[in-house]
Amino acid sequence: LTCLGGFASPGPVPPSTALRELIEELVNITQNQKAPLCNGSMVWSINLTAGMYCAALESLINVSGCSAIEKTQRMLSGFCPHKVSAGQFSSLHVRDTKIEVAQFVKDLLLHLKKLFREGQFN
């Protein structure tokens, strides 16, 4: 058999697909939750209407050693135009309330589902 060429590079994921995949991952986390998510780690609550994707990443990236949210962290890093490192709070303008990761994920999921229903893929 002759190989006539390499694999075609997959096209960029459309925003609607990317958002749906993130929603599916968050649903997966909430449904498979047995023990407290990330051992009950606390993260900064965010304003879900203001630069949400980077803010969500800046909050969650400070949780380390929690395999359940590693895929979510990776996905969110692709949703943010700038590189986010632990301890960086450029998008988290107001840091006054901490909540459990499980609650954070539920709040984020509800908001993303609403955006998806409304067709807001940007």
Epitope: L19, H82, N122
Partner: antibody, heavy 118, light 109 residues
Framework: EVQLVQSGAEVLKPGATVLISCKVS????????MHWVQQAPGKGLEWMGR????????KYAPKFHDRVTITADTSTDTAYMELSSLRSEDTAVYYC???????????WGQGTLVTVSS | QAVVTQEPSLTVSPGGTVTLTCRSS?????????ANWFQQKPGQAPRTLIY???NRAPGVPARFSGSLLGDKAALTLSGAQPEDEAEYYC?????????FGTGTKVTVL
């Protein structure tokens, strides 16, 4: 002082591949995403894609995804943009530009003019 | 793919005020589009004026300001100077890629 220095102008034939380099200095290369932008003569700006130099993760614009490859060499603090199957409409200035929240696209290379002509 | 539209050209008197807008074909522009505004003069690389919708980049004069205006991103130039004559571009982030606007040529006359 932050600097982004790009490779020189190129004149190529249709169907060829161009590789443009962007060597950075004055900051830690892996701390920021590097983006690439195209500007055809007398035309507007087009975002081509970006790379995270730390792990090589890339995002590409739908228009360019099947012809562009962005890479980074952390040993030399250099980003690369390769554009294949060149056509006349690819004649443009190509810029590398650093992006971070507090200074998005604040630093730009000097631009590399690529002319595609038979 | 989204299309980002700007006014092709606008004219402002010296000392006057002009507002440039950036419209997304996919719906309202939000803070999650991380709107950026650039100024470009002939033969030069673009210069960032505004990032993250309404944050002025370092060294940018206070006469430039960014905002959301209805369903669009907006750049307002108050007290226009002759040196502000240039092409202005916006760029919007769509979850995983940027799209630049069509550009607005601003003439100070």
């Amino acid at each position: 002082e932050v600097q982004l220095v790009q490779s020189g102008a190129e004149v190529l034939k249709p169907g060829a591949t161009v590789l443009i380099s962007c060597k950075v200095s004055g900051y830690t290369f892996t701390d920021y995403y590097m983006h690439w932008v195209q500007q055809a003569p007398g035309k507007g700006l087009e975002w081509m894609g970006r790379i995270d130099p730390e792990d090589g993760e890339t995002k590409y614009a739908p228009k360019f995804h099947d012809r562009v490859t962005i890479t980074a060499d952390t040993s030399t603090d250099t980003a690369y943009m390769e554009l294949s199957s060149l056509r006349s409409e690819d004649t443009a200035v190509y810029y590398c530009t650093r992006y971070d929240y507090y200074g998005p696209f604040a630093y730009w290379g000097q631009g590399t003019l690529v002319t595609v002509s038979s | 793919q989204a299309v980002v539209t700007q006014e092709p050209s606008l004219t402002v008197s010296p000392g006057g005020t002009v507002t440039l807008t950036c419209r997304s074909s996919t719906g309202a522009v939000t803070t999650s589009n991380y709107a950026n505004w650039f100024q470009q003069k002939p033969g030069q690389a673009p210069r960032t004026l505004i990032y993250g919708t309404n944050n002025r980049a370092p060294g940018v004069p206070a006469r430039f300001s960014g905002s959301l205006l209805g369903d669009k991103a907006a750049l307002t130039l108050s007290g226009a100077q002759p040196e502000d004559e240039a092409e202005y571009y916006c760029a919007l982030w769509y979850i995983n890629h940027f799209i630049f606007g069509t550009g607005t040529k601003v003439t100070v006359l």
